[in-house]
Interface confidence: medium
């Protein structure tokens, strides 16, 4: 497809372009700023808290553009990056370089994405085409989930109730899925 | 071209298992969600689950959940359903197809699975 | 749950035009302004006829259209040929998962 990559702040080499207007999680933008959600959590042990709602990951946002063939969006998009390990909010770092990074023995404890948005992009088109209008996923916020060593990626678990903020403007979900506490969905750039 | 081949259907006892493959070409596999849709016989699409595009997502029906086990894997372009628990209302023609910009642009031509004793 | 209600079976005559209906509560039509329309005929896979209310895909015929008001989407069929007849099932998703939904199927016979 060819893709354009460049090196991020944490010189990965990334596609700044890609078909679907979601790169996979692990692939950053350039544009990244780091936040450590739940800050100002109760002062526990790290390692004895049984505590889920003391745990949680790191919400990367990024921005990049959509593409569709030769059309490209009018402007980025801004999402979220589901990055780092799970575990107490209270250490994961506030910024690059800051804090300490608390790995749990035993099960993997990955930071996948929660919620989702969707939104409208204009899509740009060359030689004189009529823009196109499309719909997108984006990444609204992030969870940790709990892999056992006897499953696969494909079979992870909800650890707990996640760490995060009540999502704004969002009725309840009908389906018979876990009614979760969700983080502020990002603003629509549109 | 884009295709879509499912495989793996079949006669099943209830309570037994069975997996669903579906092999992908012609497409950027990595950069796409993908879904299963499943069909009664003589009734409508019904949605199963679909997974996002690295595997670290996976959303279900209330019909299937905690029963079916949707995974992928990226180095073979495939889509997998492991079905486990079966049931005779699980009887359907199960179709994979990619899942584009919230609709489902390419479908494969489907797979039978019967449960039945 | 949640569901998209269209109707069980519409009809029309060679040339005319006719319109299928998908009522959807205000979590998923309503709010998302997103609905598909699929073309299936027997023994065949769906076939993407109306994405995003009233796009249509390349290779899709311009007797096609889509529309929506309110939580009510309408797929538009006019000069209406023999092979149209199939069932049409209009789709969305729901939710902050964007989970999909699909509409229950209305069957086309072109008389």
């Known amino acids: 497809q060819g893709w354009q990559a460049f090196k991020n702040d944490a010189t990965e080499i990334i596609p700044e372009l890609g078909e679907y207007p979601e790169p996979p999680p692990e692939l950053e933008n350039n544009k990244t700023m780091n936040r450590a959600e739940n800050g100002g959590r109760p002062p526990h042990h790290p390692f004895e808290t049984k505590d889920v709602s003391e745990y949680s990951c790191r919400e990367l946002h990024f921005t990049r553009y959509v593409t569709d063939g030769p059309c490209r969006s009018a402007k980025p998009v801004t999402e979220l990056v589901c990055s780092g390990q799970c575990g107490p909010a209270r250490l994961l770092p506030n910024a690059i370089g800051r804090g300490k990074w608390w790995r749990p023995s035993g099960p993997d404890f990955r930071c996948i994405p929660d919620r989702y948005r969707a939104q409208r992009v204009q899509l740009l088109c060359p030689g004189g085409e009529a823009p196109r209008a499309r719909k997108v996923r984006l990444v609204a916020s992030c969870k940790c989930k709990r892999l056992t060593r006897f499953h696969n990626q494909s079979e992870l678990k909800d650890f707990g109730t996640e760490a995060a903020r009540p999502q704004k403007g969002r009725k309840p979900r009908p389906r018979a899925r876990s009614a979760k506490a969700n983080q502020a969905e990002l603003e629509n750039a549109y | 071209q884009v295709q879509l081949v499912e495989s793996g259907g079949g006669l099943v006892q209830p309570g037994g298992s069975l997996r669903l493959s579906c092999a992908a070409s012609?497409?950027?596999?990595?950069?796409?969600?993908l879904s299963w849709v499943r069909q009664a016989p003589g009734k409508g699409l019904e949605w199963v689950s679909n997974i996002n595009y690295d595997g670290s997502s996976t959303y279900y029906a209330d019909s299937v959940k905690g029963r079916f086990t949707i995974s992928r894997d990226n180095s073979k372009n495939t889509l997998y359903l492991q079905m486990n628990s079966l049931r005779a209302e699980d009887t359907a023609v199960y179709y994979c197809?990619?899942?584009?910009?919230?609709?489902?642009?390419?479908w494969g031509q489907g797979t039978l699975v019967t449960v039945s004793s | 749950d949640i569901a998209l209600t269209q109707p069980a079976s519409v009809s029309g005559s060679p040339g005319q035009s006719i319109t299928i209906s998908c009522t959807g509560t205000?979590?998923?039509?309503?709010?998302?302004?997103?609905v598909s329309w699929y073309q299936q005929h027997p023994g065949k896979a769906p076939k993407l006829m109306i994405y995003d209310v009233n796009n249509r895909p390349s290779g899709v015929s311009n007797r096609f259209s889509g529309s929506k008001s309110g939580n009510t989407a309408s797929l538009t069929i006019s000069g209406l040929q023999a092979e149209d007849e199939a069932d049409y099932y209009c789709q969305s998703y729901a939710g902050s998962y964007l989970s999909e939904v699909f509409g229950g199927g209305t069957k086309l016979t072109v008389l």
């Open positions: 197809a990619r899942d584009t910009y919230l609709h489902f642009d390419y």
């Open positions: 012609g497409f950027t596999f990595r950069s796409h969600w």
């Open positions: 205000s979590s998923d039509v309503g709010d998302i302004n997103d």
